[in-house]
Interface confidence: low
């Protein structure tokens, strides 16, 4: 359905709050260095065209697509050559260029402070003196730093920060209200952009095919009552978002995915009996719901695989006629039945049944050829159950923090070309798949752990491909989105690698230390020992554990010691001296 | 995205006449075999017919074989099964599938043989 006004409908269809809200964080993800008012400027001036098109469609102007509408704007900001340097030739472009070179320059890992919590006292006072700049603010400053942040889950973030304040800052102890339930945002939102990171790289590095394909499996695997032409509706629907989302076009996708939210509560009968608590909400919370749904109970009489993908000799004819949705029904088929596996493992298996039948329907005699096909699945299936085990037993043996720590020695002897930061970074939240999954049921783990891993993996493929250091690292993102999580499983000791040269700067601690927090404490730990490993890439894991009981000692002492500067400079060079010696 | 509608479903008496269509959107209909199965009360899915995308091959389940009929219009984009001497045992959900997969795709249509 076609609009005189684009700007007008989404207007319309979205309601000024909405709108407002949209506008300033794909202003905020574009342009991530510009001030907070700048962007409340331009926003504001963007409502007030909008309004005018709203009042008369035919006013000049209106009929622009909101590419030409927001480009325009963006490119009026007068620093933009200071601030960004090259970006600034994307407005030398016309539409759809201009739009793709901004994408292009959208930064995952922007040069901004990180952003320091204010006493409560001091952010109730703000929330209550103005308590629309205070919500746009925190738009804005997660915005810029999350630029593929899911825009519409954006806002539900929003009106749940809006929420806490509301309560606890009328509360008796305000810092006991408010602080857990900040933290909570903190580590949903972290964790909310990653997840969608990843579905902008399947969708931008693989292909609306890659990405609907793992829709079809999730989706399968939540609404196993759903026919496959509904999983298939959904999945195009939900594909188109995600485009427009990823795409820059936040006010389409918030628009279209409340579309999807109310066919789904329209039909949820014959999508799935888990959906009725979510359909009673407001909007934003209401597809929050519906994309956190659970897995619906699996029919009881589901019928064996094989006869329609393995015994009927029509497999072939089948498969030739109409290979993606031949292809989309097995994968609907196979996920419906197991939720039990990760997401990215049905994938895998979906990829080995193509691969054999593109071999077998070439044979002399195809049934016999692809006979054993699910044989074949037995050792993909094995090796993320055996990945897990094998992990989940180290990280109760362990604890999060030494089980990060063997994460961070296995990643820094894989890949050592990346940076430490990176490498911290990183295996730090993979060791955080210890505390979310292993305590699980079994039939829970392999999709909790694995399908995480995709994810915090991502991370290290977007960061990557900014600064390129690591053939092995471009081979594992690029290659195969599937089998991104084996590939780097499989990585041995880089042998190649070149040792760093030893600084004793890198060693040197100050009495600073002892004020960080706990989480920062370790960070400056585990900042140490990828160093460590760099340095010393074949050192044992006993070598290495001494050097880091010896650090935590000397860490302790000195900070209990009166005069915690002096500790330091001089039990410091002797932490290194020995660590050296335990080295060498 | 890809939707099967089924219709020409009710209650008749046994000898009779039935003619169903199927209406496809959503894929091309032109490239891809099509078959007809049915779900009895209780059952599980049964397969009854399948036709080739061109329409040339049609294959038949033995317990319809000279009773059912199987065919397509390409331009129309619709499958059909005229199905005559229909018996109390024919009685199920008719629904059409895309390739031969007894997979439900769509809603189906209800027939009923009784006197």
């Known amino acids: 359905d076609t609009h005189k006004s684009e700007v007008a409908h989404r207007f319309k269809d979205l309601g000024e709050e909405h709108f407002k809200g949209l506008v300033l964080v794909a202003f905020s993800q574009y342009l991530q260095q510009c001030p907070f008012e700048e962007h409340v400027k331009l926003v504001n001036e963007v409502t007030e065209f909008a309004k005018t098109c709203v009042a008369d469609e035919s006013a000049e102007n209106c009929d622009k697509s909101l590419h030409t509408l927001f480009g325009d704007k963006l490119c009026t900001v007068a620093t933009l050559r200071e601030t960004y340097g090259e970006m600034a030739d994307c407005c030398a472009k016309q539409e759809p260029e201009r739009n793709e070179c901004f994408l292009q320059h959208k930064d995952d890992n922007p040069n901004l402070p990180p952003l320091v919590r204010p006493e409560v006292d001091v952010m109730c006072t703000a929330f209550h003196d103005n308590e629309a700049t205070f919500l746009k603010k925190y738009l804005y400053e997660v915005a810029r730093r999350h630029p593929y942040f899911y825009a519409p889950e954006l806002l539900f973030f929003a009106a749940r920060y809006k929420a806490a304040f509301a309560e606890c800052c009328q509360a008796a102890d305000k810092a006991a209200c408010l602080l857990p339930k900040l933290d909570e945002l903190r580590d949903e939102g972290k964790a909310s952009s990653a997840k969608q990171r990843l579905k902008c790289a399947s969708l931008q590095k693989f292909g609306d095919r890659a990405f609907k394909a793992w829709a079809v499996a999730r989706l399968s695997q939540k609404f196993p009552k759903a026919e496959f032409a509904e999983v298939s509706k959904l999945v195009t629907d939900l594909t188109k978002v995600h485009t427009e989302c990823c795409h820059g076009d936040l006010l389409e996708c918030a628009d279209d995915r409340a579309d999807l939210a109310k066919y789904m509560c329209e039909n949820q009968d014959s999508i799935s009996s888990k959906l009725k608590e979510c359909c009673d909400k407001p909007l934003l919370e209401k597809s929050h719901c519906l994309a956190e749904v659970e897995n619906d109970e699996m029919p009881a009489d589901l019928p064996s695989l094989a006869a329609d993908y393995v015994e009927s000799k029509d497999v072939c004819k089948n498969y030739a006629e109409a290979k993606d949705v031949f292809l989309g029904m097995f994968l609907y088929e196979y996920a419906r039945r197991h939720p039990d596996y990760s997401v990215m493992l049905l994938l895998r298996l979906a990829k080995a049944y193509e691969a054999t039948l593109e071999k077998c329907c070439a044979a002399a005699d195809p049934h016999e050829c692809y006979a054993k096909v699910f044989d074949e699945f037995q050792p993909l299936v094995e090796e993320p159950q055996n990945l897990v085990k094998q992990n989940c037993e180290l990280f109760e043996q362990l604890g999060e923090y030494k089980f990060q720590n063997a994460l961070l020695v296995r990643y820094t002897k894989k890949v050592p070309q990346v940076s430490t930061p990176t490498l911290v970074e990183v295996s730090r939240n993979l060791g955080k798949v210890g505390a979310k999954c292993c305590k699980l049921p079994e039939a829970k783990r392999m999709p909790c752990a694995e399908d995480y891993l995709s994810v915090v993996l991502n991370r290290l493929c977007v960061l990557h491909e900014k600064t390129p250091v690591s053939e092995k690292v471009t081979k594992c993102c690029t290659e195969s989105l599937v089998n991104r999580r084996p590939c780097f499983s499989a990585l041995e000791l880089d042998e190649a690698y070149v040792p760093k040269a030893f600084n004793a700067e890198t060693f040197t601690f100050h009495a600073d230390m002892c004020t960080l927090s706990e989480k920062e404490k370790q960070v400056k730990k585990q900042t140490a020992l990828v160093e460590l490993v760099k340095h010393k890439p074949k050192a044992t894991k006993e070598q290495l554990k001494g050097v880091m009981d010896n650090f935590a000692a000397f860490v302790e002492k000195c900070c209990k010691a009166d005069d915690k500067e002096a500790c330091f400079a001089e039990e410091g060079p002797k932490f290194v001296a020995a660590s050296q010696a335990a080295l060498a | 995205e890809v939707q099967l509608v089924e219709s020409g479903g009710g209650l008749v008496q046994p000898g009779g006449s039935l003619r169903l269509s199927c209406a496809a959107s959503?894929?091309?209909?032109?490239?891809?075999?099509m078959s007809w199965v049915r779900q009895a009360p209780g059952k599980g899915p049964e397969w009854v017919s399948a036709?080739?995308?061109?329409?040339?091959?049609?294959r038949y389940a033995e317990s319809v074989k000279g009773r059912f009929t199987i065919s397509r219009d390409n331009a129309k984009k619709t499958l059909y099964l005229q199905m005559n001497s229909l018996k109390p045992e024919d009685t199920a959900v008719y629904y059409c599938?895309?390739?031969?997969?007894?997979?439900?795709g769509s809603q189906g249509t209800q027939v009923t043989v009784s006197s």
């Open positions: 599938t895309i390739g031969r997969s007894t997979s439900r």
């Open positions: 959503g894929f091309t209909f032109g490239s891809f075999g």
């Open positions: 036709i080739d995308s061109g329409g040339a091959d049609t």
